[in-house]
C-alpha cells in the first residue's frame, strides 16, 4: 500500500521539516523560517507558536517541531501545552477579577494559585483545634477533648470577629 501510495502521491515522500510544493511541481521544499511540519507528506508547513509577552520560550521552534512556551515569572501555566498564563498571588490570597485578594476569615490558601478553602472543622471528627488556622495555613486538629488528660485544655480559636476579608468572586 505504501509503495502504491508513493507512486500515486509524490508528496508522501516529503519528510518532516519539508512540504510538498505545488508551485514547484510537487518538489519537497524545506519549511520557511518560523514554520514547521512535524509529519511527512504535508502540503503546507504550520506557523511556529510565538512566545511573547506573558509567555516565554521553553523550547525553540525547529523545522520539525513547534515552539513550546511557559509563563513569564509572576504568572503560571493553565491549559494543555500552557495555552494560557494566569497571575500568581501570595499565599493567603486568591485570584479574582479584581486581582489578588486576601482570604476571608475562616479560609486559607497555602499556594500561589487556586482558591481559598475553608479551615478543617475539627469537631466533625470529634477532635479539637490544636493549632489555629491562618490565611496561609489550615488548622491543626488534635485529640478529641475526651482524650485530653484532666486539667489539659485545647487551644480554642479566638472569638469570630471578622477580619477584613474578601468574598470569593
Amino acid at each position: 500500500f505504501e509503495r502504491t501510495r508513493s507512486l500515486q502521491d509524490p508528496c508522501s515522500n516529503c519528510p518532516a521539516g519539508t512540504f510538498c510544493d505545488n508551485n514547484r511541481n510537487q518538489i519537497c521544499s524545506p519549511c520557511p523560517p518560523n514554520s514547521f511540519s512535524s509529519a511527512g507528506g504535508q502540503r503546507t508547513c504550520d506557523i511556529c507558536r510565538q512566545c511573547k509577552g506573558v509567555f516565554r520560550t521553553r523550547k525553540e521552534c525547529s523545522s520539525t517541531s513547534n515552539a513550546e512556551c511557559d509563563c513569564t515569572p509572576g504568572f503560571h501555566c493553565l491549559g494543555a501545552g500552557c495555552s494560557m498564563c494566569e497571575q500568581d498571588c501570595k499565599q493567603g490570597q486568591e485570584l479574582t477579577k479584581k486581582g489578588c485578594k486576601d482570604c476571608c476569615f475562616g479560609t486559607f490558601n497555602d499556594q500561589k494559585r487556586g482558591i481559598c478553602r475553608p479551615w478543617t472543622n475539627c469537631s466533625l471528627d470529634g477532635k479539637s483545634v490544636l493549632v489555629n488556622g491562618t490565611k496561609e495555613r489550615d488548622v491543626v486538629c488534635g485529640p478529641s477533648p475526651a482524650d485530653l488528660s484532666p486539667g489539659a485544655s485545647s487551644v480554642t480559636p479566638p472569638a469570630p470577629a471578622r477580619e477584613p476579608g474578601h468574598s470569593p468572586q
Epitope: L78, G79, S83, Q87, K97
Partner: nanobody, 123 residues
Framework: QVQLVESGGGLVQPGGSLRLSCAAT?????NYWMNWVRQAPGKGLEW???????????YYVDSVKGRFTISRDNAKNSLYLQMSSLRAEDTAVYFC????????????????SGQGTTVTVSS
C-alpha cells in the same frame, strides 16, 4: 492571525502622563476581557488592570488606582491605558493581553499578548 500590537510608550518625567494603545487584529475585541500587565526591569510580570467586554467593569492593582484608566473602543478594535501622575516605579514594559475563553468564570488566564511598549519615568 490573532495579534496584539502595543504603542505609545516613551520617556516621561515624574508626574507626567502617557496614553498607551493596543491594536487587536484577527479577532473581535468585543468578545473578550482585556488586560494590561507590566514587567519592570529585573522584576516579574505584574497585572495592572482589566476591563470587561463592554467596558462596564474595570479593575486595577492598588498601586495604580486613581492614576491609571483602562478603556476600550470596540469599534476600532483597540484597548487603551491612560497613565497620569507617573512615578519612577511605573517604569516597565507594558503588555496588553487577552483574557482567554472563560476568563472571569473559572479562570483568569491570558491567552494572547503583544510584544510590549516601554515606559520610562525619569527626570
Amino acid at each position: 492571525q490573532v495579534q496584539l500590537v502595543e504603542s505609545g510608550g516613551g520617556l516621561v518625567q515624574p508626574g507626567g502622563s502617557l496614553r498607551l494603545s493596543c491594536a487587536a487584529t484577527g479577532f473581535t475585541l468585543s468578545n473578550y476581557w482585556m488586560n494590561w500587565v507590566r514587567q519592570a526591569p529585573g522584576k516579574g510580570l505584574e497585572w495592572v488592570a482589566n476591563i470587561n467586554q463592554d467596558g462596564s467593569e474595570r479593575y486595577y492593582v492598588d498601586s495604580v488606582k486613581g492614576r491609571f484608566t483602562i478603556s476600550r473602543d470596540n469599534a476600532k478594535n483597540s484597548l487603551y491605558l491612560q497613565m497620569s501622575s507617573l512615578r519612577a516605579e511605573d517604569t516597565a514594559v507594558y503588555f496588553c493581553a487577552r483574557g482567554g475563553e472563560g476568563y472571569g468564570v473559572n479562570h483568569y488566564g491570558l491567552d494572547v499578548s503583544g510584544q510590549g511598549t516601554t515606559v520610562t519615568v525619569s527626570s
